[in-house]
Interface confidence: medium
């Protein structure tokens, strides 16, 4: 379950630099396809963006504010912050963090958001927030397998690929014959690249993957690779040769 | 129609940089993100990294970073790769990669780039 | 920066009736294709939620009596038959272009 949890300090002085930490869980901020944003909300006013940060670390920030603010992640990858300097009562406000649906190239839009936390600006007395730190990461394997393996025409062939860690449907295979480029066969587990014949079938989801060619011809004979596309760096198998039996 | 030109084939000495291109062409470069990928003979793929031709933001698989750096050229529509200390290890086909209109990866790829580094 | 300008400011409609949002950008948000734009339904002492994103596609679990249409700079938000629970502030938002923008909002009441 995607979840978004803002904390910091419900009241700060003028002038006080402001820090927010957005804690998330249910999702990974290494992971290729997200981001997560600042917005903020005056009382009874509209949204206004503040800030975004990627998970290849590209940040933006809002034109008017930028001067004032600084976001990070924490390398912890579960925490983002925002800091915002030289705080003013015109600063009040409620201050959502989001989760950006970021498909690689094109930012997209928020598919869930914290509950908000409202920070008000005066001279009165201070309040403080806090936040903990959850674990590291590490690269995805992929491991295929078998490595290698004898078929005749006219055979069925299964070849699996096991990611060490949950990785939805981000994954696609290729094909790779000596000395050519890899062509796409599988994209999102299960989808058929357009132009490829349908005795190639993908399915699985989570760790475990499969892809089928239903009746093996002359032209299979090659190298198959899986990718996994959910974290970076993206990571391949380790191949699977398919070769004439005999 | 959708195309990546590689540069030619390479053979350089250990211990010198090489920098190899990638030219896009048949699509507006802007909205796209160019990945490379190395495999070494005989062996299975590594992705290195990418970069977007919208404002030059890069993702670096830590195992290369410091060893490659990603540029881009919007005037010619051309991304590069520089490698730096090359070493036996670096001789390898790289290819320059694009994803298809559905949002996943490596639909399209340029035809591959040899680097022989040798003594 | 793009500016989006919603309108009306605020809408009254009686419970069934077709209610109509506009929201115009002052350049074009379109890219490879896509609008954008996107729809959210905020209501009082609540974060915003995502109800339509790219101009027209349907946020998973959101009524279908929600819709989206348009491109390049100009937008619809329709909600066809309006229920009660349906009264709140609806902003749109683009993602084209840095800094991302919302609509000034639009607030929905039953007549």
């Known amino acids: 379950q995607v979840t978004l949890k803002e904390s910091g300090p419900v009241l700060v002085k003028p002038t006080e630099t402001l820090t927010l930490t957005c804690t998330v869980s249910g999702f990974s901020l290494s992971n290729a396809r997200m981001g997560v944003t600042w917005i903020r909300q005056p009382p009874g006013k509209a949204l206004e963006w503040l800030a975004h940060i990627f998970s290849n670390d590209e940040k933006s920030y809002s034109t008017s504010l930028k001067s004032r603010l600084t976001i990070s992640k924490d390398t912890s990858k579960t925490q983002v912050v925002l800091t915002m300097t030289n705080m003013d009562p015109v600063d009040t406000a409620t201050y959502y963090c989001a989760r950006i649906r970021d498909y690689y190239d094109i930012s997209s839009y928020y598919d869930y958001w914290g509950q908000g936390t409202l920070v008000s600006v005066s001279s009165g007395g201070g309040g403080s927030g806090g936040g903990g730190s959850g674990g590291g990461g590490s690269d995805i394997q992929m491991t295929q397998s078998p490595s290698a393996m004898s078929a005749s025409v006219g055979d069925r062939v299964t070849i699996t690929c096991r990611a060490s860690q949950d990785i939805s449907n981000y994954l696609a295979w290729f094909q790779q014959k000596p000395g050519k480029v890899p062509k796409r066969l599988i994209y999102a587990a299960s989808s058929l690249q357009s132009g490829v014949p349908s005795r190639f079938s993908g399915s699985g989801s989570g760790t475990e993957f499969t892809l089928t060619i239903s009746s093996l011809l002359p032209e299979d004979f090659a190298t198959y690779y899986c990718l996994q596309l959910n974290s970076f760096p993206f990571t391949f198998g380790g191949g699977t040769k398919v070769e004439i039996n005999g | 129609e959708v195309q990546l030109q590689q540069s030619g084939p390479e053979l350089v000495k250990t211990g010198t940089s090489v920098k190899i291109s990638c030219k896009a062409s048949?699509?507006?470069?802007?909205?796209?993100?160019i990945h490379w990928v190395k495999q070494s003979h005989g062996r299975s793929l590594d992705w290195i990294g990418s970069?977007?031709?919208?404002?030059?933001?890069?993702t670096y698989n830590q195992k290369f970073k410091g060893k490659v750096t990603f540029t881009v050229d919007t005037s010619s529509s051309t991304a590069y790769m520089q490698f730096n200390s090359l070493t036996s290890e670096d001789s390898a086909v790289y290819y320059c990669?694009?994803?298809?209109?559905?949002?996943?990866?490596?639909?399209?790829w340029g035809q591959g780039t040899l680097v022989t580094v040798s003594a | 920066d793009i500016v989006l300008t919603q309108s009306p400011a605020s809408l009254a409609v009686s419970l069934g009736q077709r209610a109509t949002i506009s929201c115009r950008a002052s350049?074009?948000?379109?890219?490879?294709?896509?609008?954008?734009l996107h729809w959210y339904q905020q209501k009082p002492g609540q974060p915003p939620t995502l109800l339509i994103y790219?101009?027209?596609n349907l946020e998973s679990g959101i009524p279908a009596r929600f819709s989206g249409s348009g491109s390049r700079t100009d937008f619809t938000l329709t909600i066809n038959s309006v229920e009660a629970d349906d009264v709140a502030t609806y902003y749109c938002?683009?993602?084209?272009?840095?800094?991302?923008?919302f609509g000034g909002g639009t607030k929905l009441e039953i007549k």
């Open positions: 048949g699509y507006s470069i802007t909205g796209y993100y």
């Open positions: 970069i977007s031709f919208y404002n030059g933001a890069t």
């Open positions: 350049e074009s948000v379109d890219s490879y294709g896509y609008s954008f």
């Open positions: 990669g694009r994803r298809g209109d559905d949002y996943d990866v490596f639909a399209y």
């Open positions: 790219r101009a027209s």
């Open positions: 938002q683009q993602s084209n272009e840095d800094p991302w923008t």
